[in-house]
């Protein structure tokens, strides 16, 4: 798995809705693949982490003044929806095909 | 200034182009305000850090399993352009009014 010493990448993160208290309204699935962005944004920033100009600048400043300025951070840059079955206000089980922004599609340095 | 103990916020970061080796092609300005996103993404994530659903989920999982999953990260969510004077291929000083993505406009938890 990707640790702090490895480069920014998408890693597995299985989330159980019961663990985060969302099982009270999400009926199914019981868990899903959320993914997590892990790893460092090291110089030089590779194309696959789609760095912004600001991230490139911050990386260069960090290289020069590592105690003053932090590195860019490995974060989700594109998210995907999941489908969930939930209870509406009337308690009716309802399917939401596209519950947006729940799963990482891509990671990058920002 | 915002440290790891404070909440995610935009802080000043003056960048000198000579420090990052960009003075070879950027004539002016000599430095600019890039800003930096600093601070933690603590539970509960406030509206002003415009959290995605994934960031909220990750924050909740981190709360439950702090050693297994990291917190969401404080990063630029909106960037602004700056104007730069540079030399073109013919060595002609040319103004680029909108050199995109160089300065932080907003920070958020991702």
């Amino acid at each position: 798995s990707a640790g702090a010493g490895s480069h920014c990448q998408k890693t597995s993160l299985r989330v159980n809705f019961e663990d985060i208290g969302w099982d009270s309204w999400i009926i199914a699935p019981k868990e899903y693949e959320a993914y997590e962005c892990k790893g460092g944004c090291f110089f030089p920033l590779a194309d696959d982490v789609t760095p912004t100009k600001h991230a490139i600048v911050q990386t260069l400043v960090h290289l020069k003044f590592p105690t003053k300025v932090g590195k860019a951070c490995c974060v989700p840059t594109k998210l995907s929806p999941i489908s969930v079955l939930y209870k509406d206000d009337m308690g009716v089980p309802t399917l939401k095909y596209h519950y947006e922004g729940m799963s990482v599609a891509e990671c990058g340095c920002r | 200034s915002a440290g790891a103990g404070s909440h995610c916020q935009k802080t000043s970061l003056r960048v000198n182009f000579e420090d990052i080796g960009w003075d070879s092609w950027i004539i002016a300005p000599k430095e600019y305000e890039a800003y930096e996103c600093k601070g933690g993404c603590f539970f509960p994530l406030a509206d002003d850090v415009t959290p995605t659903k994934h960031a909220i989920v990750q924050t909740l999982v981190h709360l439950k399993f702090p050693t297994k999953v990291g917190k969401a990260c404080c990063v630029p969510t909106k960037l602004s352009p700056i104007s730069v004077l540079y030399k073109d291929d013919m060595g002609v000083p040319t103004l680029k009014y909108h050199y995109e993505g160089m300065s932080v406009a907003e920070c958020g938890c991702r």
């Epitope: - | 004539i27 300005p29 104007s83 004077l85 002609v92 000083p93 040319t94």
Partner: antibody, heavy 119, light 111 residues
Framework: EVQLVESRGGLVQPGGSMRLSCAAS????????MNWVRQAPGKGLEWVAH??????????HYAESVRGRFTISRDDSKSSVYLQMNSLKTEDTGIYYC??????????WGQGTLVTVSS | DIVMTQSPDSLAVSLGERATINCRAS??????????MNWYQQKPGQPPKLLIY???NQGSGVPDRFSGSGSGTDFTLTISSLQAEDVAVYYC?????????FGQGTKLEIK
């Protein structure tokens, strides 16, 4: 080598017209703003007009002293810029320089051509 | 329009001595941390040539004895050690806004 060569000027009567042209070489003409700058005899430099790039829809700007009388145009396929001068006045007399450059500076200059407006 | 005023109108300096020409703008010609100020040299019978741009940067092929300084409304062109070939008229010019305007020129001669 960058070269800007203006057409020959000449003598014209007040109220008359004249068209100047400028042929460019040695640089990618279509990438640069083109300008006309003039210099009255024994006097200083005065910007007359400029024309921007295709990406700017060939926007033009003129000095107040010539607006409505002079028209700048360009033909990127011929690497040429033109100045159509109508309703000429005696105070339009001077050396007319064709200049190329950016949105910041006059980088390239022609040798200039003398336009004399006199009766 | 931004009015550019140079001083002096003419200047006589001995060979090897320092020459200083000033230029004042009627309003600031700085924006975005950039000075929209250029200097041109015009030798007798020749077209002008870009000397200094962005207040302090030397144009291509310009000798090191030429330098520029200043910001906002006040700018200076300095020739550290005058050479015979420096005899010319020097113009400041702003490109912050249209119409781009020149100073009236400073004629530099040898004393």
């Amino acid at each position: 080598e960058v070269q800007l060569v203006e057409s020959r000027g000449g003598l014209v009567q007040p109220g008359g017209s004249m068209r100047l042209s400028c042929a460019a070489s040695g640089f990618t003409f279509s990438n640069y703003w083109m300008n006309w700058v003039r210099q009255a005899p024994g006097k200083g430099l005065e910007w007359v007009a400029h024309i921007r790039l295709k990406s700017d829809n060939y926007a033009t700007h003129y000095a107040e002293s010539v607006r409505g009388r002079f028209t700048i145009s360009r033909d990127d396929s011929k690497s040429s810029v033109y100045l159509q001068m109508n309703s000429l006045k005696t105070e339009d007399t001077g050396i007319y320089y064709c200049t190329g450059g950016s949105n910041y500076v006059f980088a390239f200059w022609g040798q200039g051509t003398l336009v004399t407006v006199s009766s | 329009d931004i009015v550019m005023t140079q001083s002096p109108d003419s200047l006589a300096v001995s060979l090897g001595e320092r020459a200083t020409i000033n230029c004042r703008a009627s309003e600031s010609v700085d924006n975005y941390g950039i000075s929209f100020m250029n200097w041109y040299q015009q030798k007798p019978g020749q077209p002008p040539k870009l000397l200094i741009y962005a207040a302090s940067n030397q144009g291509s092929g310009v000798p090191d004895r030429f330098s520029g300084s200043g910001s906002g409304t006040d700018f200076t062109l300095t020739i550290s050690s005058l050479q015979a070939e420096d005899v010319a008229v020097y113009y400041c010019q702003q490109s912050k806004e249209v119409p781009w305007t020149f100073g009236q020129g400073t004629k530099l001669e040898i004393k």
